[in-house]
């Protein structure tokens, strides 16, 4: 049994790390393989993530951490039973995939303006919380290519469009997700989208 | 809001025995190292004792034998079981929560060892 | 035991001058776990900076920190009524725990 592709591991930067690998042939990830895990501080223990299969040869393990800081550096070994198939170590401030946004709401009772909000995915003490910028996917469900991204750079979670600059009188559906430029962390994973009916009043056109 | 609150200094004869508490709130106490650091009248920080998520736990020379240091995540609390006090145990004690360093303090509780 | 020295002692300095602060290891440290703190009387310690040169939330970026190996340096470019206090480095270190030096006093002249 042996390691074809090495695991590689993304961080929430909470509390949760990812890590994926492909073995060289068809595997039962959970009963031939344990991943142990080390957070490189005095008092910290190891312990040991029970992968789950991802693809016939592929294997996944999401390691539970204690709360992120930048200097943290966890060891990994992939063990099979008595054999040391892999070691290697993960710095989850280098490799940053944020948690995706919840709670996204559109407001379409402020005249003629629509108003997205969502809710950050962060506690106010973790680092991320004050750096992630975000990208708003609106779409048709009509007109597949209506379809168009809002990046907001700024912090607050919101969104304010003119209800004009989307055809009145369809459904559209939004989403949203983040970033943080600090950690040059990968997009996070789109929110659960929502849906509206877009409609406003025309403006009369005067002859 | 991250708040650590801390209670049970006073007075204790030498030899004698306290408990010291500090109560987290505002961050996800189970998954935080936590510690305690002294300063002595008119003196300097000293780091005390800190404990890891998984209760491991390690303590500063001048106190280890004496001083227990305990978490219980249920109640999102933090302890200092001082046994055996000498004078130069006296202090203001913080609880403290952090890693490599301390970004979260408690207000500090004093620990007065006289006869 | 890593042994940190600060010095000066005492700072004397007026209002918007510049404030130079060292921190002296008796062996290397990391600097992924060097931090600076400020201290008022009868307040907590306040992080300032951590890993040598990172300010802490909310911190002001009139305050700086640099260096490496066993030498560190925090600086104040210019001090504020509000910046007299004690300044502590503090170190950890795998093997011999947490230690912090033994406090510089920032002072109006």
């Known amino acids: 049994m042996k390691v074809l592709q090495e695991p590689t591991c993304v961080s929430d930067y909470m509390s949760i790390s990812t890590c994926e690998w492909k073995m060289n042939g068809p595997t039962n990830c959970s009963t031939e393989l344990r991943l142990l895990y080390q957070l490189v501080f005095l008092l910290s223990e190891a312990h040991t993530c029970i992968p789950e299969n991802n693809g016939g040869a592929g294997c996944v393990c999401h390691l539970l951490m204690d709360d992120v800081v930048s200097a943290d550096n966890y060891t990994l070994d992939l063990w099979a039973g008595q054999q040391l198939l892999w070691k290697g170590s993960f710095k989850p401030s280098e490799h940053v995939k944020p948690r995706a946004p919840g709670n996204l709401t559109v407001h379409t009772n402020v005249s003629d303006t629509l108003l997205l909000t969502w809710s950050n995915p962060y506690p106010p003490d973790n680092y991320l919380y004050n750096h992630l910028t975000y990208a708003v996917n609106i779409w048709s469900e009509n007109d597949p290519a209506d379809f168009r991204i809002y990046n907001v750079t700024y912090l607050e979670p919101s969104l304010r469009i003119a209800a004009s600059t989307l055809k009145s009188g369809i459904s559209y559906r939004a989403r949203v997700r983040a970033w943080a430029q600090c950690y040059n962390t990968t997009w996070s994973e789109w929110s659960p989208s929502t849906k509206w009916h877009n409609s406003y009043r025309e403006p009369f056109e005067q002859h | 809001e991250v708040q650590l609150v801390q209670s049970g200094g006073g007075l204790v004869h030498p030899g004698g025995s306290l408990r010291l508490s500090c109560a987290g709130s505002?961050?996800?106490?189970?998954?935080?190292?936590m510690f305690w650091v002294r300063q002595a009248p008119g003196k300097g920080l000293e780091w005390v004792s800190g404990?890891?998520?998984?209760?491991?736990?390690n303590y500063a020379d001048s106190v280890k034998g004496r001083f227990t240091i305990s978490r219980d995540n249920a109640k999102n609390s933090l302890y200092l079981q001082m046994n055996s006090l000498r004078a130069e145990d006296m202090a203001v004690y913080y609880c403290?929560?952090?890693?490599?360093?301390?970004?979260?303090w408690g207000q500090g509780t004093l620990v007065t060892v006289s006869s | 035991e890593i042994v940190l020295t600060q010095s000066p002692g005492t700072l004397s300095l007026s209002p918007g001058e510049r404030a130079t602060l060292s921190c002296r290891a008796s062996?290397?440290?990391?600097?992924?776990?060097l931090a600076w703190y400020q201290q008022k009387p009868g307040q907590a310690p306040r992080l300032l900076i951590y890993g040598a040169s990172s300010r802490a939330t909310g911190i002001p970026d009139r305050f700086s920190g640099s260096g490496s190996g066993t030498d560190f340096t925090l600086t104040i470019s210019r001090l504020e009524p509000e910046d007299f206090a004690v300044y502590y480095c503090q170190q950890y270190d795998h093997s011999a725990g947490w230690t912090f030096g033994q406090g510089t006093k920032v002072e109006i002249k």
């Open positions: 505002g961050f996800t106490f189970s998954r935080n190292a």
């Open positions: 062996q290397s440290v990391s600097s992924s776990y």
């Open positions: 404990i890891g998520t998984g209760g491991a736990t």
């Open positions: 403290a929560r952090g890693r490599y360093y301390f970004p979260w």
